[in-house]
């Protein structure tokens, strides 16, 4: 066992001479992003104050390619890198094409309306006038490709004029536009060469030891890894912590059960019920507030102040009033919960599916004519699953080195 331990320690650290280095650098696991949209069936009725009705469309599946660049080894046992992602539509795995039309809330109009609720009435009336002139409405009919990767919208220019420096978009707006062909920030992580217990843990993200999106030190902490590998020799008492630039926060998953993936022993980690709980139910989350109902997390502070919320798909594990407020939602543990299956000896994921939902808080705002009589509601826009499973040559090598070899050595 100590010989095996030595082998593991030697081969999991981030070091060009280690077996797993190339696996860390260019993840050989095929990752897929499956996106499900909530097609709004009754936009006119919502504007009159009726309950929203949605229909899930999808999945629209993309192959996700990741590669690390600007890899710099520092002299404090850390390595810095940028990880770039590109997405390629997979028609054969998808239920529909990127040219499918989806009726969706107009995030720019409805988001701006909620953001301006407490602004002077004059500004709100100017916005109404602008929206009318520009033909901007509360709901839009756009293609999947446009929603994902961006569409030209004159409102982007208008928002940049009235709210300078707040909006990360120029000319085009798309929900996943910032992810494609771009990096998720500069990560500096421990290599484990000098101290294996800190391997993969994030030292800094974009040069920061903590973020300032939230209202408490605990919520602002950058904890865990960058979300791809974890320290070796896990036990059922271990938790799986990682910093997610997309959620602008650290997340902690808990051990659920042991299992086997393609002959390799694994630990399954899942989201605790408290992950998106509000501060009154789970006090440590108070720093993520102001909160609405429990089970959704306000990400407006890191998403250009738009009233966007992150949750489990279909408001799984959230306050039931959220799913009841929208017709067409059916939360289901099997279909909508996330998991990571980790090989506990190495801390390397074998099979995972991270599922999250993005929703928009919308309501009628006095002075913004386009909001009509919309009753306050958190309306799901889409949910996605980022999934990957080790396969092929990588799996074979992994199985040989970490399952077969130790068994042979044991005997």
């Amino acid at each position: 066992p100590s010989l095996i331990k030595q082998q593991v320690l030697k081969n999991v650290r981030i070091d060009p001479s280690s077996l797993s280095f190339n696996m860390w650098k260019e993840i050989p696991i095929p990752f897929y992003l499956s996106v499900y949209f909530f097609d709004v069936m009754n936009p006119s009725e919502i504007l009159k104050g009726e309950k929203p009705q949605v229909r899930e469309r999808g999945p629209y599946v993309y192959r996700e390619f990741r590669h690390k660049s600007n890899i710099t080894f520092n002299n404090n046992d850390t390595v810095s890198f940028l990880e770039y992602r590109t997405f390629q539509f997979q028609p054969s795995k998808s239920h529909g094409s990127e040219s499918d039309y989806i009726v969706m809330p107009n995030i720019l109009v409805l988001g701006a309306a909620v953001m301006m609720e407490n602004k002077p009435m004059t500004l709100k009336l100017i916005m109404t006038l602008a929206f009318t002139t520009l033909g901007e409405r509360a709901f839009m009919n756009r293609t999947v490709g446009e929603i994902m990767w961006g569409y030209k919208d004159p409102l982007v220019n208008l928002i940049n004029k009235y709210f300078p420096g707040m909006f990360p978009f120029k000319d085009k707006f798309g929900l996943f536009a910032e992810l494609n062909n771009s990096d998720s920030g500069l990560f500096t992580v421990f290599t484990g060469v000098q101290n294996i217990s800190r391997i993969h843990l994030v030292d800094k993200w974009n040069g920061l030891s903590k973020v300032d999106f939230w209202h408490s030190d605990q919520c602002n902490m950058i904890n865990g890894t960058s979300g791809q590998m974890w320290p070796p020799f896990m036990t059922p008492e271990s938790s799986l912590e990682f910093y997610s630039p997309e959620a602008c926060r650290s997340m902690k998953l808990m051990y659920k059960e042991s299992g086997v993936f393609e002959g390799i022993p694994t630990y399954r980690f899942v989201a605790p019920k408290t992950l998106f709980a509000n501060g009154s139910i789970y006090p440590p989350n108070e720093g993520f507030c102001p909160c609405l109902e429990s089970g959704i997390q306000n990400v407006s502070t890191c998403r250009f102040s738009a009233p966007l919320f992150l949750s489990h798909p279909h408001f799984l594990n959230a306050d039931p009033v959220l799913a009841e407020a929208v017709t067409g939602l059916h939360p289901n543990q099997e279909a909508h919960s996330l998991f990571l299956d980790i090989h506990p000896v190495t801390g390397i994921p074998m099979n995972c599916s991270v599922k999250l939902q993005l929703s928009l808080y919308m309501k009628s705002v006095a002075g913004i004519g386009q909001t009509g009589k919309i009753e306050p509601v958190v309306l799901p826009l889409l949910w996605f699953a980022e999934s990957g499973a080790m396969e092929g040559e990588t799996l074979h090598t992994f199985y040989t080195q970490l399952v077969l070899m130790p068994k042979v050595m044991h005997y």
């Epitope: 009336l125 006038l129 002139t133 520009l134 409405r137 509360a138 004159p154 220019n157 002075g367």
Partner: antibody
Framework: EVQLVQSGAEVRKPGATVKISCKLT????????IFWLQLAPGKGLQWMGL????????IYAEKFQGRVAITADTSTDTAYMEVSSLRSEDTAVYYC????????????WGRGTMVTVSS | LPVLTQPPSASGAPGQRVTFSCSGS????????VNWYQQLPGAAPRLLMH???QRASGAPDRFSGSKSGTSASLAITGLQSEDEADYFC???????????FGGGTKLTVL
């Protein structure tokens, strides 16, 4: 179907005041913003101001600020525009318009009110 | 003078194709979408095109709109006598914080 019905033509002397009306029919008045526009000879259309009848909030184009007052009477579903200190260059057709919720641009217009300013 | 510049008149024979231009600047057409209004003789203006290239409800598919840089255009194919009217372009102007219009083009069907 929403319609805007405007009051008839008016003739005024320079320095006088004119008040024209615009009644919304076919739907709930307070669900619509009312916009006022001027069509003067050789000047094209110009936006003058708007009102949200729900709470009587208004804004005006800089050019018309101070001389124009837009009001609304929710009991009669009518918006009004008053122009004071009339000058000969105020001779124009004045339109009220709205955008039905969910539509784009000014998609419902009144027929216009001709105002002639002449001594 | 109107903020947006339109030729005062245009003409065409029935069945022909006519195009109207509308010229602006970076603070209006250059940054934002364009609407077109049609005003038939003795009637109120009517929304014809919105968001540059979208026909308003009830507008025939003979009408199309486009934009390039700080200029926009409206085209009518298969000209008909009932198209005889004034055509106004409009856009948001972020230096004036309001919509601006052209002086209108009077179309005569020969």
């Amino acid at each position: 179907e929403v319609q805007l019905v405007q009051s008839g033509a008016e003739v005024r002397k320079p320095g006088a005041t004119v008040k024209i009306s615009c009644k919304l029919t076919g739907d709930t008045f307070t669900d619509y913003f009312i916009f006022w526009l001027q069509l003067a000879p050789g000047k094209g259309l110009q936006w003058m101001g708007l009102i949200d009848p729900k709470d009587a909030q208004t804004i005006y184009a800089e050019k018309f600020q101070g001389r124009v007052a837009i009001t609304a009477d929710t009991s009669t579903d009518t918006a009004y525009m008053e122009v004071s200190s009339l000058r000969s260059e105020d001779t124009a057709v004045y339109y009220c318009a709205t955008d039905s919720v969910g539509a784009a641009g000014f998609d419902v217009w009144g027929r216009g009110t001709m105002v002639t300013v002449s001594s | 003078l109107p903020v947006l510049t339109q030729p005062p008149s245009a003409s065409g024979a029935p069945g022909q194709r006519v195009t109207f231009s509308c010229s602006g600047s970076g603070s209006n057409i250059g940054s934002y979408t364009v609407n077109w209004y049609q005003q038939l003789p003795g009637a109120a203006p009517r929304l014809l095109m919105h968001t540059t290239d979208q026909r308003a409800s009830g507008a025939p598919d003979r009408f199309s709109g486009s934009k390039s840089g700080t200029s926009a255009s409206l085209a009518i194919t298969g000209l008909q006598s009932e198209d005889e009217a004034d055509y106004f372009c409009a856009a948001w102007d972020d230096s004036l914080d309001g919509p601006v219009f052209g002086g209108g083009t009077k179309l005569t069907v020969l």
